[in-house]
């Protein structure tokens, strides 16, 4: 607010006032009169820049008059009282109400005193963020979508992620005239490593006390990525039972595991138990390539592992033996 005048009467008002679409707003405006100064106010006037005539007048004897009586009201001025507060309330704010307004006091003996106020009409946007479920494409595709609906002015959308990615932001008119819907897509080449990771959409707007953060959990659909664990190249005759595990990462989850060998079905010493393969003790050396084939809704992938059971001192190793 401008500082009060030192020796003269001064009109005090904020340079800018925000108001929300459809709501009411008060344009504050006061006459500041220094202690030793004498002034008499006979009229309060509000006018909008670029429009002919005044929109509201409070006259010392005629009282208030308005260009739109249902939408305007002097909040403090009263007949028979000192006219020092010209604050004006506007109801049912519309987009077209945004603009510059002049608040004016007709005073004696100083003459007219006025100040300009910028009325900013805001609309608070509604924000949503959602995942765009994708498959492996090898090309950059939208993986997350953030929408700020019905903001005035348009909201600012930014993305925060350790994964890289590029935003693609667009605007369209909102449902209410003068409002804007902002849509931002977060674009990246899909990979299995990204599946399940988070990205954050940050929406900033004049009407927010602080930015809104919306987290999106990414979804990438991909066929199984398969490996076999549990073998350390040190299996010997006489060792205890051992277990191999078919490790599969996929989205959606695997629907089936199938164990086999390069020669066909499993040998008798290998017993399939879903994702695991139980290797029973053997009494002669073997050299077999095992295959784990994993299926999900997107397809099947397999991993191979060559297992050797060698002769050697069982006492020195964890074993495959009958005990």
């Amino acid at each position: 607010w401008p500082p009060p005048g030192t020796g003269d009467v001064v009109v005090q008002a904020p340079t800018q006032v925000p108001g929300f679409l459809g709501d009411s707003v008060t344009l504050p405006c006061y006459l500041q009169v220094p202690n030793m100064e004498v002034t008499h106010v006979s009229q309060l006037t509000w006018a909008r820049h670029g429009e002919s005539g005044s929109m509201a007048v409070f006259h010392q004897t005629q009282g208030p008059s308005y260009s739109e009586s249902k939408r305007l009201e002097f909040v403090a001025a009263r007949l028979g009282a000192e006219l020092r507060n010209a604050s004006l309330r506007m109801f049912g704010l519309r987009v077209e109400d945004e603009g510059n307004y002049t608040c004016l006091f007709v005073t004696f003996p100083q003459g007219s005193r006025s100040v300009d106020i910028w009325l900013r009409v805001l609309a608070k946007p509604q924000n949503t963020a959602e995942v765009q479920k994708v498959q492996l494409t090898g090309e950059p595709v939208p993986m997350a979508r953030c929408v700020s609906t019905g903001g005035r002015p348009p909201a600012q959308i930014t993305w925060h992620s350790d994964l890289g990615g590029m935003p693609n932001t667009s605007q369209v008119p909102g449902f209410l005239s003068g409002t804007v819907t902002v849509t931002s897509l977060w674009i990246l080449v899909p990979s299995s490593q990204v599946d399940g990771k988070n990205v954050t959409c940050k929406v900033e707007h004049e009407s927010f006390e602080k930015p809104q953060l919306l987290t999106v959990n990414l979804t990438v659909y991909y066929p199984p990525e398969v490996s076999i664990s549990g073998y350390d190249n040190n299996w010997y005759l006489g060792q205890n039972e051992a277990t191999l595990t078919c490790d599969a990462r996929s989205n959606p989850e695997p629907t089936g595991y199938n164990w086999s060998t390069t020669m066909g079905p499993l040998p008798p010493f290998a017993v399939a138990q879903g994702a695991q393969l139980l290797i029973r003790p053997v009494d002669k050396p073997i050299n077999t390539t095992l295959i784990c084939n994993v299926t999900n809704a997107l397809g099947a992938r397999q991993a191979e592992l060559t297992v050797q059971v060698k002769e050697g001192p069982p006492s020195e190793h964890s074993g495959i033996s009958r005990n």
Epitope: T45, Q60, L104, V106, F108
Partner: antibody, heavy 116, light 107 residues
Framework: EVQLVQSGSELKKPGASVKVSCKTS????????MHWVRQPHGKGLEWIGG????????SYNQRFKGRVTITVDKSTSTAYMELSSLRSEDTAVYYC?????????WGQGTLVTVSS | DIQMTQSPSAMSASVGDRVTITCKAS??????VAWYQQKPGQPPKALIY???YRYSGVPDRFSGSGSGTDFTLTISSLQAEDLAEYFC?????????FGQGTKLEIK
Amino acid sequence: EVQLVQSGSELKKPGASVKVSCKTSGYTFTEYTMHWVRQPHGKGLEWIGGIHPNQGETSYNQRFKGRVTITVDKSTSTAYMELSSLRSEDTAVYYCARWTGDFDYWGQGTLVTVSS
Amino acid sequence: DIQMTQSPSAMSASVGDRVTITCKASQNVGTNVAWYQQKPGQPPKALIYSASYRYSGVPDRFSGSGSGTDFTLTISSLQAEDLAEYFCQQYESYPYTFGQGTKLEIK
């Protein structure tokens, strides 16, 4: 009912002074500024000056500065306008008028004739 | 000082006519303009304040418009009793100034 009743016509010689009164009724005298406006015969209106009865604060048209004095008597709710060093071009009807930014009530007018 | 230039200075119109009187200020006066009617031998009577607001009791055939430097007083349907002189006045800044008047005659 608001009323502003002015004193009667005056005939004055050049160089003399005239004091016109304006007695008010029907409203609170101290709540409104009182002004004076003159109108030469067949001509337009000219603002002379005004006074706030409460504090006695005045404002004058520079054209009359030094020659005009506006005063009030709060006890009788009366305003006065005195114009000195009269010349023939000061011949006019002098009105008191209650100020509301514009002038909403006027006295009936006082004809002041300056002639040798 | 702000000059208020009124036109026309005199005009004649018939009962029922629409009459327009204009007033041009030499500088921006916002909406701080009043219009007065003065009948012969009487003091002026306030019709319009703040450029476009009618005083209570003033017939609605009288209307004012404008802001800035250009102002208009309109009588939508002239009546015989509207025979008078009309003045505009600015009260944006001191000294207050008036237009030179428009004398309206009835044909």
